[in-house]
């Protein structure tokens, strides 16, 4: 499942890139899942992807911001855990999560991605595979 791990890691890098341009994002409050319950990570992930993060269209950073946002919304390679979670109906709806401005939104997204990487690594039976 290296492809899944790479994709999650890439998303973190894209979030870090966007954090550099947080002042050029529309200061809108967006649903930002935090302390996501076990088995609802993919549901929370889709909430982050659905959020309307937008460039404020100011200055010359608009293109890189828009490309970054577009890349964040791309569907990652699916995993068994992800497929199982898609059938859960008990996870909170996106609207039920606390809304936060872009800076906190991105920080919480990064935290979730890190948690998902950690879970993915923990589910591996041995640690000597190719990184």
């Amino acid at each position: 499942q290296d492809r899944h791990m790479i994709r999650m890691r890439q998303l973190i890098d894209i979030v870090d890139q966007l954090k550099n341009y947080v002042n050029d994002l529309v200061p809108e409050f967006l649903p930002a899942p935090e302390d996501v319950e076990t088995n609802c990570e993919w549901s929370a992930f889709s909430c982050f992807q659905k959020a309307q993060l937008k460039s404020a269209n100011t200055g010359n950073n608009e293109r890189i911001i828009n490309v970054s946002i577009k890349k964040l919304k791309r569907k990652p390679p699916s995993t068994n855990a992800g497929r199982r979670q898609k059938h859960r109906l008990t996870c909170p709806s996106c609207d039920s999560y606390e809304k936060k401005p872009p800076k906190e939104f991105l920080e919480r997204f990064k935290s979730l991605l890190q948690k998902m990487i950690h879970q993915h690594l923990s589910s591996r039976t041995h640690g000597s595979e190719d990184s």
Partner: antibody, heavy 117, light 106 residues
Amino acid sequence: QVQLVQSGAEVKKPGASVKVSCKASGYTFTDYWMHWVRQAPGQGLEWMGLIDTSESYTIYNQKFKGRVTMTRDTSTSTVYMELSSLRSEDTAVYYCARYGPLAMDYWGQGTLVTVSS
Amino acid sequence: DIQMTQSPSSLSASVGDRVTITCRASQDISNYLNWYQQKPGKAPKLLIYYTSRLHSGVPSRFSGSGSGTDFTLTISSLQPEDFATYYCQQFHTLRTFGGGTKVEIK
């Protein structure tokens, strides 16, 4: 097996630009992003940035922003790193390194760039 | 930016010695730390990723530990081929390397 082969050594004058290439083989080029790292003589490693090999999306170390440009050519499985407005402090060995799942898992052999008047 | 500080910057040891290198991050990086080995005139090679996981082909005498801000690379029994410079690298926020630790023959 995975191989990253870089272009040869370069000598440049201050103010000039240099373009280093890194040709990948042994894996699907567009499946892995690529990092660039440099090392000044007798010094440590410094991360310069990375490029998405499938879409040319780049993330640069703020220190090099405005001076570095990373590109790729999917037809030849090659990535390029161009550094402009060279100064003596840019004398270093420049490495490409594959973006593995959690680490730089394979490295090129390095390209020495000497900036001297 | 996250700063990475390695200590010592150099050390002398003999074959068979147990060697410990430490790396400290300027802020919490969880387990997002890698270790690389570099020999003179060569490119770095990945040894350990995500704090403690051995990259394929790396001998089991190498091990890594730590979490948060303090990390350790241990070589349980130094071999002739282990004399080299070792770098830690964080990947919590983009990438930063430590200054390196040169392991020399005593």
